[in-house]
Each structure stands twice: as structure tokens, then as C-alpha cells.
Amino acid sequence: VLEVYYTSLRCRCVQESSVFIPRRFIDRIQILPRGNGCPRKEIIVWKKNKSIVCVDPQAEWIQRMMEVLRKRSSSTLPVPVFKRKIP
């Protein structure tokens, strides 16, 4: 599941990892666009063992995975859905 969140909070990620996480262990991916108090885009991966990791948006594997997820969501939904939430 790919989710885009707009929040009014400051940056959520203190540390980012570029270590590959296989899709089989990923529960959902949360994207926090830059702005609203945080100068950078943040990607938060929620794993199936309930742990959470911030992933470097420049990591090649997460870019590939998000592209695949975007293509899939655009082929199943007529219009992309962006959730506006305050976690």
C-alpha cells in the first residue's frame, strides 16, 4: 500500500537507511512530501513485524518500488487518491 500524507508536523525521520527491504516484508509505505515544516521528502516503511524504518528517498530500490506501486494504483484507480491526515 502506498500512502501520501500531508502533515503540519516537523520532520518525522531522525535517521534514514538505504538498506534494501524485500517487498514481502513491507506492510505499507508512507510518503511525507517536503514542506509544512520539513525541508525534505520523507519515506517511512512499516514492516510486517510492526517495526518502522525511515528510508533514504534517494535509495534506488525504494524509487523502483514506488514506481511499481504508482503504476499499479494508476491502472486500478481512475484518479489517484491522496489521503490528507494528521498522524
Epitope: F20, R23, K47, N49
Partner: antibody, heavy 123, light 106 residues
């Protein structure tokens, strides 16, 4: 040559505990995730647990979660499976397997397996 | 949880012939499927990963294909050493094995 040798299996009563071990050689153990998979008497294969290369991440299916614990000792090249509150349905041959996912381009799932150790849960 | 339905559960074929085994997933597994050969007293041997990529050292007689929910595995020019049980495994969402196919030679 990659080698995985399981040990520690045996006969245990329902509700009992058992710890399985897997000795790895022929590859850099600390660079690979590892898994346990079992084969039931009906010859079905079931995934049991996976641990990341450094040991910080573990994953289990719901039917063993809370009863089984996977762990590793990278200094000794050993993988472990601590099983507790054992049930008759845990009777199986238990295999350890190397889980290779170097990147999204190199994701082979479980590429090398041991020969297994047998666990029987019976009163 | 993803279910993997493998068929047939057993089959018999002649030496030199060809067999095909199928696995159907309960949802799209995005080509994340492997195929294993399992012989008694040994651990499973990985033949193919990511639907169709042959492991090093595996003869080209073995092949795999598919997409979405439907996948197949074939062995051509059957040889006596191919007698074994074959399993599929999805690794798109955790792990689920198919029920296995026992191959016998006529």
C-alpha cells in the same frame, strides 16, 4: 560450497520445548538473512521464521508467533529456532535455509537448504 | 494470506517427454515465485527464481513462465534423475508454498 547442517530435533511431549540449531559454512553468514521451513508428515512445506542478516528483524507466520523464536550468532555462524508450547501439529522435518535478497535485482528467496532435522511432538 | 494452489498433485511421464506443473495464487504475486526440486533425504533445491530465471548450473530443460496469479513450470526431455517432488513458493507477501507435485517416470 554452501553447507547448512541442522541439529537438535527429537521427540518432545505436547507443551514442551526444543531448540534447533543450524551450522552454516561456505559463505559469509553475517551477510545473509536466514529462514526456517518445515515439511509436515503430509509433505506440505510451511514457512516458520526469517531473521535478517544482522538479527535485528524477525518475521513469523501467525501459527507460530509467540511460541517460536528465531535467533542467530554471527560470530559462530549458527542459526537457532527456540520452540516452546509445542503442539502435535508442529511435528515435521525442520530445514534451515539461506534467504538471499541482496537488492531488488538480486532476490532469490531461499536459495540453499540443509538436509533437515526431525521433530516429533507426541505424548 | 496468499494461498498457492499447485496442480497436479502427482503425475507420471515417459523418459524424454515433457511435463508442466501450474501454480495459481489467490492474488497477484508480481512474478515473485520460485520453483524447487525436493528429493527424499535432502533439502529442496532451487531451480528457478522470479518466475523464469534459471539458477546457475540448472539445465535449460527446466523452464518457468507466468504473470499475475498464474504460473507454470516445465521440464522437457525428462531424465531419470528428475524423479522428485516439485514445489512453487510465492515470496511477494511473506512466503507460501504450493502443495507439491510428485513426479514419477512411466
Amino acid at each position: 560450497e554452501v553447507q547448512l547442517v541442522e541439529s537438535g530435533g527429537g521427540l518432545v511431549k505436547p507443551g514442551g520445548s526444543l531448540k534447533l540449531s543450524c551450522a552454516a559454512s561456505g559463505f559469509t553468514f553475517s551477510s545473509y538473512a536466514m529462514s526456517w521451513v518445515r515439511q509436515t508428515p503430509e509433505k506440505r512445506l510451511e514457512w516458520v521464521a526469517t531473521i535478517s542478516d544482522g538479527g535485528s528483524d524477525t518475521y513469523y507466520p501467525d501459527n507460530v508467533k509467540g511460541r517460536f523464536t528465531i535467533s542467530r550468532d554471527n560470530a559462530k555462524n549458527n542459526l537457532y529456532l527456540q520452540m516452546s508450547h509445542l503442539k502435535s501439529e508442529d511435528t515435521a522435518m525442520y530445514y534451515c535455509a539461506r534467504d538471499y535478497y541482496g537488492s531488488s535485482y538480486e532476490d532469490y528467496a531461499m536459495d540453499y537448504w540443509g538436509q533437515g532435522t526431525s521433530v516429533t511432538v507426541s505424548s | 494470506d496468499i494461498q498457492m494452489t499447485q496442480s497436479p498433485s502427482s503425475l507420471s511421464a515417459s523418459l524424454g517427454g515433457k511435463v508442466t506443473i501450474t501454480c495459481k495464487a489467490s492474488q497477484d504475486i508480481n512474478k515473485y515465485i520460485t520453483w524447487y526440486q525436493h528429493k527424499p533425504g535432502k533439502g529442496p533445491r532451487l531451480l528457478i527464481h522470479y518466475t523464469s530465471t534459471l539458477q546457475p548450473g540448472i539445465p535449460s530443460r527446466f523452464s518457468g513462465s507466468g504473470s499475475g496469479r498464474d504460473y507454470s513450470f516445465s521440464i522437457s526431455n525428462l531424465e531419470p534423475e528428475d524423479i522428485a517432488t516439485y514445489y512453487c513458493l510465492q515470496y511477494d507477501n511473506l512466503y507460501t508454498f504450493g502443495g507439491g507435485t510428485k513426479l514419477e517416470i512411466k
